[in-house]
Amino acid sequence: MKGTKDLTSQQKESNVKTFCSKNILAILGFSSIIAVIALLAVGLTQNKALPENIKYGIVLDAGSSHTSLYIYKWPAEKENDTGVVHQVEECRVKGPGISKYVQKVNEIGIYLTDCMERAREVIPRSQHQETPVYLGATAGMRLLRMESEELADRVLDVVERSLSNYPFDFQGARIITGQEEGAYGWITINYLLGKFSQKTRWFSIVPYETNNQETFGALDLGGASTQITFVPQNQTTESPDNALQFRLYGKDYNVYTHSFLCYGKDQALWQKLAKDIQVASNEILRDPCFHPGYKKVVNVSDLYKTPCTKRFEMTLPFQQFEIQGIGNYQQCHQSVLELFNTSYCPYSQCAFNGIFLPPLQGDFGAFSAFYFVMNFLNLTSEKVSQEKVTEMMKKFCSQPWEEIKTSYAGVKEKYLSEYCFSGTYILSLLLQGYHFTADSWEHIHFIGKIQGSDAGWTLGYMLNLTNMIPAEQPLSTPLSHSTYVFLMVLFSLVLVIVAIIGLLIFHKPSYFWKDMV
């Protein structure tokens, strides 16, 4: 009987084992098939080429006061995606802007050498020949061209010949329009902020990025011009000259833009000095925009060396005059306001000088000199109200020059001396020029970099010239790289676990089954 009983229990055990093994086998088989299919599906739909093919691009920003070279890189397979291009290098060319080389064009080649050699080092040699180089000149060269087209053309010709000597794919040097400068700045910041992306994100990695797709306006301040660009609420414009239409990533944008030539911070200062010296009783100009105790001699010939001061030009009974700082924000502000003609407006609303400006809409990124100046003054925080900024400016401007020099020993005196004027000018331009208010001030975000890339027109310029901003939403890979990696790892783990369980089941002794029954 005992033997029969043992046999029956063995049969039972065998039946259970067969039944379990069949079920487990089915489950394991099904799981591994699902995992393999998922791996193939994710891998094939993502179609990510490895190793990644990296492309580079170079843009030179030939500004009025200096030239900067920017190097950008991006994965070749993703060049139509949003936010994939990022800056890897910025090289500031030693010396003034290229327009200052008009009487010494033969020196331009040497001037550009250091930064072009730096680009040669940063970009892998194998990529040199396919790396495009663009040079865009802005308001400094626009002003030179107003004086003489030939002079501006000669400078650009020497620049082109110099840049053609490098192993890169030189695509030309040109003076970009004020409209382009504004538009490309707007494209840059919205591209970097992810505003053109139609994908919903699991998390945000950009500090200013919001869940909505409302674009940011762009406020750009240079040495010789300033630009304002944004999407107004009302899509019909009173001034076609200030209207731009874009179709980017499948969406239409009606953009307002204007560039105010001569209203960059350096040219605005020359304008203010030329205006104020008209009423000076002698060769001393007591100036509220400079710190008390500050003194500087200015040549009258230098004052009138720009088309921006022509409207104030007059014969003065002296060749030189001395600026003597008195450091009074309120008086400086008043003096600056006289640069903005607000008495004439042929539209429903104007900025200044009879230029149409629609009502401000949304958030604004203020970059370039807006950021540099406000950052120096420690006023870029989102928490600082307009009233606080004004208070800080009053305090800063009234500080004696000797004290300022001691406090900021590492800063070049030429730049240091002008922060009081520049800060006051920025406030005047934003509040009285563009009609920001104490309330709307909180919508201005002073931005230096976004995800490591400088805010400015250069990135937008390159994206446009390399056709990396499609009009329609591209048929992009359906998953972000991080999601793709996560799913690949997950399904690989499922396969590994299935394999381990399978091995355990089919290579374990019979007591494994006893324990299970």
Partner: antibody, heavy 123, light 106 residues
Framework: EVQLVESGGGLVQPGRSLRLSCAAS????????MNWVRQAPGKGLEWVSS????????SYADTVKGRFTISRDNAKNSLYLQMNSLRAEDTALYYC????????????????WGQGTMVTVSS | DTVLTQSPASLAVSPGQRATITCRAS??????MHWYQQKPGQPPKLLIY???NLASGVPARFSGSGSGTDFTLTINPVEADDTANYYC????????FGQGTKLEIK
């Protein structure tokens, strides 16, 4: 009507100096570059010197560099040419000429000319 | 200096015919070539600027063409009043003039 009137020419001995003036009217003087161009008797035209509208660019022909100085007084709508160390080969009719414009941009061609003032350098 | 060579040095054309004057630059001057007419005892008068643009008040009988190094001034048809010296001038580098072409009407 645009008018350019030169003065200051005359007979001068070699090595001496002379100052030519050009009085401009009929246009916004400080918006235009100005020039001196000369023409020796029976010969062709020779550019002497340029002064751009905002004094960004001042230049001279090699034949006069270091001896002649161009200047302008925008408030007086006047252009000047200070000529030092004069030579016999500087003998010519000296024209004051205005730079032209390509639309909104300045151009280094000459759209209006004065009648000229004669400079004779002889001992 | 950019040297400008005009040809011919002189030419005689009958009224109603076409007169063609050429100007060759020793180096490329883009389109920065200009043409002047000078009658005896008068200052030069601008005819053409930037290779092909007619100066204000100049009859459409005058036309200019060319770019780089080779430029042409054409007068078609020629009139008796066109007797004068004609000069080309480049402005790509510091200004230089051609040596002049004397046009006579037969």
């Amino acid at each position: 009507e645009v008018q350019l009137v030169e003065s200051g020419g005359g007979l001068v001995q070699p090595g001496r100096s002379l100052r030519l003036s050009c009085a401009a009217s009929g246009f916004t003087f400080n918006n235009y570059g100005m020039n001196w161009v000369r023409q020796a008797p029976g010969k062709g035209l020779e550019w002497v010197s340029s002064f751009s509208s905002s004094s960004t660019y001042i230049s001279y022909a090699d034949t006069v560099k270091g001896r002649f100085t161009i200047s302008r007084d925008n408030a007086k709508n006047s252009l000047y040419l200070q000529m030092n160390s004069l030579r016999a080969e500087d003998t010519a009719l000296y024209y004051c000429a205005r730079h032209g414009r390509y639309g909104g941009y300045g151009g280094f061609y000459f759209d209006y000319w004065g009648q000229g003032t004669m400079v004779t350098v002889s001992s | 200096d950019t040297v400008l060579t005009q040809s011919p040095a002189s030419l005689a054309v009958s009224p109603g015919q076409r007169a063609t004057i050429t100007c060759r630059a020793s180096e490329g001057v883009k389109s920065y070539m200009h043409w002047y007419q000078q009658k005896p005892g008068q200052p030069p008068k601008l005819l053409i600027y930037k290779a092909s643009n007619l100066a204000s008040g100049v009859p459409a009988r005058f036309s200019g063409s060319g770019s780089g190094t080779d430029f042409t001034l054409t007068i078609n048809p020629v009139e008796a009043d066109d007797t004068a010296n004609y000069y080309c001038q480049q402005s790509w580098n510091d200004p230089t003039f051609g040596q002049g072409t004397k046009l006579e009407i037969k």
